[in-house]
Interface confidence: low
């Protein structure tokens, strides 16, 4: 059966949004006005995994892209990566563990925790314009809470 | 025009199993959950579960769990649901429903877009 | 375990408005989606609100839905009633926790 899927942009905390940064790299900075149309829409599919109130398993490719936000191991940390796909057999309902972020729910906030690697979370630095990343820590110097804003298809 | 025909009314004798289905026609048959529901004469609708065609998953509401079986065969486009062990208060119309998903901000839920007919299943002695 | 409450029934008159409630018992109903269902005697439930308060197609726009977080239920109103309303409604939900489909259990609308 077909997966469900949402088209959605986030941006974290402090408001910063994201954006393409080459061609398999994510990078957050603050946009205004008409570059508000540069961040990227997420397609966000609802897929099987441990699931609970506050935690939701999704897969965040980029909306009309054959890209998925993935977590592997480089050089023994866990890496986020954006992944190439065959668009045939993607987003599925089962996705590879690599591909699921648990989405959780704190005070309004997001936070999308690696399936993959337990209590890794995507970050974004505080610093402009750099790339997101998969951070191991919560509550640091590093950014793991997002909003998501909803755009229809 | 997608239709969900069902077969015809049964009786049962407490006890028996009984087979009822449910052929799709107008969709692809394995892109949409199958749901079965269930109404006692002069009460509401309850939730029996769901197969998803494309691999047989299956979920069972707690209450029918271990007596009921819900299936599909893609061959023939035909959703099943048998229920055993029979007593009186299975008495009731099934119907099958098709699901359809949606999401938005806010969350996900089901909506049934289109429903079966409806068959009796009478359990009597 | 997640339930929908419904008033057994509602009486109204001809081209009244009339104001279904569906109280959802633990867990926001802002959560997951609210579908309404009219279901006449005889016949299967056809959907005539579906994601809260959208309509189906062919659904008069006299029919509307909506979801109130602060008393944790979802509304079916239905205004310049007519006796072909007359019918049993039933919200439906979705309880992701579990994921397991609800239904409340069905209010008669009769119109006087």
């Known amino acids: 059966a077909p997966v469900r899927s949402l088209n959605c942009t986030l941006r974290d905390s402090q408001q910063k949004s994201l954006v393409m940064s080459g061609p398999y790299e994510l990078k957050a900075l603050h946009l205004q006005g008409q570059d508000m149309e540069q961040q990227v829409v997420f397609s966000m599919s609802f897929v099987q995994g441990e699931e609970s109130n506050d935690k939701i398993p999704v897969a965040l490719g980029l909306k009309e892209k054959n890209l998925y936000l993935s977590c592997v191991l480089k050089d023994d940390k866990p890496t986020l990566q954006l992944e190439s796909v065959d668009p045939k057999n993607y987003p599925k309902k089962k996705m590879e563990k690599r591909f699921v972020f648990n989405k959780i729910e704190i005070n309004n906030k997001l936070e999308f925790e690696s399936a993959q690697f337990p209590n890794w979370y995507i970050s974004t630095s505080q610093a402009e314009n750099m790339p997101v990343f998969l951070g191991g820590t919560k509550g640091g110097q590093d950014i793991t809470d997002f909003t998501m804003q909803f755009v229809s298809s | 025009e997608v239709q969900l025909v069902q077969s015809g009314a049964e009786v049962k004798k407490p006890g028996a199993s009984v087979k009822v289905s449910c052929k799709a026609s107008g969709y692809t048959f394995t892109s949409y959950y199958m749901h079965w529901v269930r109404q006692a004469p002069g009460q509401g609708l309850e939730w029996m579960g769901l197969v998803d065609p494309e691999d047989g998953e299956t979920i069972y509401a707690e209450k029918f769990q271990g007596r009921v079986t819900i299936t599909a065969d893609t061959s023939t486009d035909t959703a099943y649901m048998e229920l055993s062990s029979l007593r009186s208060e299975d008495t009731a119309v099934y119907y099958c429903?098709?699901?359809?998903?949606?999401?938005?901000?806010?969350?996900?839920?089901?909506?049934?877009?289109?429903w079966g007919q409806g068959t009796l299943v009478t359990v009597s002695s | 375990n997640f339930m929908l409450t419904q008033p057994h029934s509602v009486s109204e008159s001809p081209g009244k408005t009339v104001t279904i409630p569906c109280t959802a018992s633990?867990?926001?109903?802002?959560?997951?989606?609210v579908q309404w269902y009219q279901q006449r005697p005889g016949s299967a439930p056809t959907t005539v609100i579906y994601e809260d308060s959208q309509r189906p197609s062919g659904v008069p726009d006299r029919v509307s839905g909506s979801i109130d977080s602060s008393s944790n239920s979802a509304s079916l109103t239905i205004s310049g009633l007519k006796t072909e309303d007359e019918a049993d409604y039933y919200c439906q939900s979705y309880d992701s926790a579990n994921d397991r489909v609800t239904f409340g259990g069905g209010t008669k609308l009769i119109v006087l």
């Open positions: 429903a098709r699901v359809e998903w949606v999401a938005g901000t806010e969350g996900w839920g089901y909506y049934f877009d289109y």
């Open positions: 633990s867990g926001s109903i802002a959560n997951n989606f």
